[in-house]
């Protein structure tokens, strides 16, 4: 009988995975390593995918290898000594100073360098720097960008505003609707803040004498509604008004004179008033009453080579007539002429040059007050120092407004190096149909009184009084201010701009950056304004936009029985 | 497996000294950062001075309560650290630990070796 | 410096019943860490990073909390879950521990 072999020679078993060979009859048995299975200990067990021992016990990365397995961890994590925990490196304490200047934050695996809003971490300066938001086209139209954050603005000037995204911009629109009708058959007397409206010239037969009939509606008190001179400037005759009244210069070769009479005539209505040369004097009359008869002994302008030859102005003389009357006027003269017939020869050829021009027309109705159109400013130079006063400058403020439109600067002072060391402002409010009144010192805003309806029929009434110390709102009206201290700190910058040259600008600013106020649109509607205690008179201005009218203001253009009629009770002028 | 053996502890004066030994194994000891932590019945647990590895200098961190008196340092090439104490007091009495730390918590603790300051 | 408060100090638990213990902080903290001690023995790393619970830790337990209000709870008390837990952090080169809370059975 033939001996069986050894079953274990040669080895069967796989030499890697087994760990002893057992020979039995004509058969053997392989007995395997751990992590060995199989027959012949052929197979590697993967430990990895072991249903009893999920993942292999790992708490991250489990990594099969023939005959074992080991954990690992991910990127950013640590082993922990049983080999089989990974934990988070916190790199934000292994190396505190790993993001510079910026705030190190621990995330799982890794770590952010963490800047405040508006901030960019540089990876190679360590720190943290300005986001310029305004290279990024945030903003619709001018973006301002400054440590930190940005601020869009829209150009008001141009009658845009800053929409509630804070980003976009949005036309300011009409709150209240004026009728802004006008007749060509009416001329307008104030169409040039500084100039006459129209000059005529006459070429008439000697026998001819001056004459001048026409209707005249005014507000004005004081202001120049015609001169007539002759061809060599040696006779010359002024029709004006002075506190309300006609008044009459004139200057010959054989007289000069000054006269003022009849009732008062800026009183809004069409007043119908003519200048008559008589053989020995001139006559004066409104509605068709004589209220003037002013002596001459001889003719007003003398002839030359048979003809009568006269020059003619309207609103206004020429300039160096000036220094040649016999009582100073400011010639500025807010009001309307019609149906006026010069040295007898009617309106022929007057109203075919008007009809052209539309701003020589004037508004058909017409009510007591100054209109800003919303296309320009005025410029006034006020002393707000008061030597008697203890507190230094002081800023006593009475506005009577009837916005037209929601959103625009109403007062403002400005100072030479362009900055804007206080305005009020019109603001449209978020509520619907209301509007905010906003006071800021530069670019901030000190005082907001909230919520009020004021494009009504009727006029709002605000009163404030400032100095070094104090903002007083002598208005009953829910305010919304700065903490105590920050408005110090803001009336401190006014105080420094208010012992150097301010100029005081109604109905918007003058080219100012757009970042110098919160509201940089111009006003639009109608408003007097009153600054320690003296009426500012638009024709007394240093500068005034021709389109402002100083003392005509446009009508409402229907007025409805609805709430948006309704103002608060508190903002009406009880005088 | 990580295995770490306190030693030196006994009872001393107020105002002597004493050294601990740590005997370390199981692990990469020069890569790793080693801790003392003690633990008394008044305090409870209580860090008291770290050593970090060769990559981090050896550099050393100290509990405001033991700086100026306690010295910890280590012995890689004999997987050992140690803490020299010095001008000791009777507050420092309690259990010390011997702890390997991983990324600031105290992954494996020895059985600690009991330090007693009274007179 | 940071100050670690635990609260209760002492608690006990009837087997089954769920355990919640806290650790507050005086300043805000990325993470906590909770150990295991019981009587005898050396304190054991039991959940690290708040949340994450060593390899051999029932399931039973959890951690959870941010800022500086850190909690480990127990759903279901076993009688092996009485020891003292205690709460560490690491900030500025300083490592707190709080006070413990010491888990007895019912």
């Known amino acids: 009988v033939n001996a069986i072999p050894d079953q274990c020679s040669p080895l069967p078993c796989n030499e890697d995975g087994y760990m002893s060979c057992k020979d039995g009859k004509a058969s053997f048995t392989c007995t395997c390593k751990p992590g060995w299975q199989g027959e012949k200990c052929e197979f590697d067990i993967n430990e990895c995918k072991d249903p009893s021992n999920i993942n292999g016990g790992c708490s991250q990365i489990c990594d099969n290898t023939p005959g074992s397995y080991h954990c690992s961890c991910k990127s950013g994590f640590v082993m922990l000594s049983n080999k089989k925990d990974c934990k988070d490196v916190d790199e934000c304490s292994l190396k505190p100073n790993m993001c510079g200047t910026a705030v190190c934050k621990n995330i799982p695996g890794d770590f952010e360098c963490e800047c405040p809003e508006g901030y960019r971490y540089n990876l190679k300066s360590k720190s943290c720097e300005d986001v310029d938001e305004c290279s990024e086209n945030m903003c619709a139209q001018l973006c301002v960008n400054y440590p930190g954050g940005y601020t869009c603005y829209c150009d008001g000037k141009k009658g845009f505003k800053l929409a509630q995204d804070q980003k976009s911009c949005e036309a300011v629109s009409v709150c209240l609707p004026l009728n802004l009708d006008t007749k060509y058959e009416l001329l307008y007397l104030a169409e040039q803040f500084a100039g006459v409206v129209l000059y005529l010239k006459f070429r008439l037969p000697e026998i001819s004498r001056f004459s001048a009939e026409f209707d005249f509606r005014t507000y004005d008190s004081q202001g120049v509604i015609l001169y007539a001179e002759s061809i060599d400037h040696s006779a010359w005759l002024l029709i004006a008004l002075r506190g309300g009244k006609i008044e009459v210069q004139l200057k010959n070769e054989h007289t000069s004179k000054i006269t003022t009479g009849g009732d008062i005539i800026n009183n809004g209505l069409w007043n119908m008033v003519s200048v008559e040369e008589l053989e020995h004097s001139i006559s004066i009359k409104i509605a068709k009453e004589a209220v003037m008869d002013i002596n001459k002994p001889g003719p007003l302008f003398k002839p030359e080579n048979g003809l009568l030859e006269t020059k003619v102005y309207f609103a206004g003389f020429p300039r160096k007539v000036e220094s040649e009357l016999i009582k100073p006027i400011n010639p500025r003269l807010d009001g309307c002429i019609r149906s006026w017939n010069l040295m007898k020869q009617g309106a022929s050829g007057i109203k075919e040059i008007i009809q052209e021009k539309q701003n020589k027309h004037c508004l058909v109705t017409v009510e007591k007050g100054s209109y800003y159109p919303g296309s320009g400013i005025a410029e006034f130079h006020i002393d707000y120092n008061n030597g008697s006063n203890a507190e230094g400058w002081h800023i006593n403020v009475t506005l009577n407004i009837r916005p037209s439109m929601g959103t625009g600067v109403m007062l403002a002072l400005v100072s030479s190096n362009n900055t804007v060391p206080f305005a009020v402002s019109l603001v449209d409010s978020t509520s619907e149909k209301s509007q905010d009144i906003v006071i800021s010192v530069e670019n901030t805003v000190i005082y907001r009184i909230q919520a009020l309806s004021l494009c009504s029929n009727q006029r709002s009434h605000l009163e404030f009084r400032v100095n070094r110390n104090n903002l007083e709102l002598l208005t009953p009206l829910k305010i919304e201010t700065i903490s105590q201290e920050e408005l110090q700190t803001q009336l401190a910058i006014l105080d420094k701009a208010m012992k150097g040259k301010v100029a005081t600008y109604l109905g918007g600013l003058p080219d100012v950056p757009f970042s110098a106020t919160p509201v940089n649109a111009f006003y639009n509607g109608c408003m007097e304004v009153n600054i320690n205690g003296v009426e500012l008179d638009l024709d007394e201005a240093i500068s005034k936009h021709n389109d402002i009218r100083a003392h005509s203001c446009p009508s409402v253009w229907k007025k409805t029985k609805n709430s948006e009629d309704q103002v608060d009770p508190r903002l009406i002028d009880g005088k | 497996e990580v295995k770490l053996e306190e030693s030196g502890g006994g009872l001393v004066q107020p105002g002597g000294s004493m050294k601990l030994s740590c005997a370390a194994s199981?692990?990469?000891?020069?890569?790793?950062?080693m801790d003392w932590v003690r633990q008394s019945p008044e305090k409870g647990l209580e860090w008291v001075a770290e050593v970090r590895s060769k990559a981090d200098n050896h550099a050393t961190y100290y509990a405001e309560s033991v700086k100026g008196r306690f010295t910890i340092s280590r012995d890689d090439s004999k997987s050992a650290v140690y803490l020299q104490m010095n001008s000791l007091r009777p507050e420092d009495t309690g259990i010390y630990y011997c702890?390997?730390?991983?990324?600031?918590?105290?992954?494996?603790w020895g059985q600690g070796t009991t330090l007693t300051v009274s007179s | 410096q940071i100050a670690l408060t635990q609260s209760p100090a002492i608690m006990s638990a009837s087997p089954g019943e769920k355990v919640t213990m806290t650790c507050s902080v005086n300043?805000?903290?990325?993470?906590m860490h909770w150990y295991q001690q019981k009587p005898g023995s050396s304190p054991r790393l039991w959940i690290y990073?708040?949340?994450n619970l060593v390899s051999g830790v029932p399931g039973r337990f959890s951690g959870s909390g941010s800022g500086t209000s850190y909690s480990l709870t127990l759903s279901s008390m076993e009688a092996e879950d009485a020891a003292t837990y205690y709460c560490q952090q690491y900030s500025g080169y300083l490592y707190t521990f709080g006070g413990g809370t010491k888990l007895e059975i019912k």
């Open positions: 990073d708040t949340s």
């Open positions: 702890t390997l730390t991983t990324a600031f918590l105290f992954d494996s």
């Open positions: 199981g692990f990469t000891f020069s890569d790793a950062w």
């Open positions: 300043s805000s903290v990325s993470y």
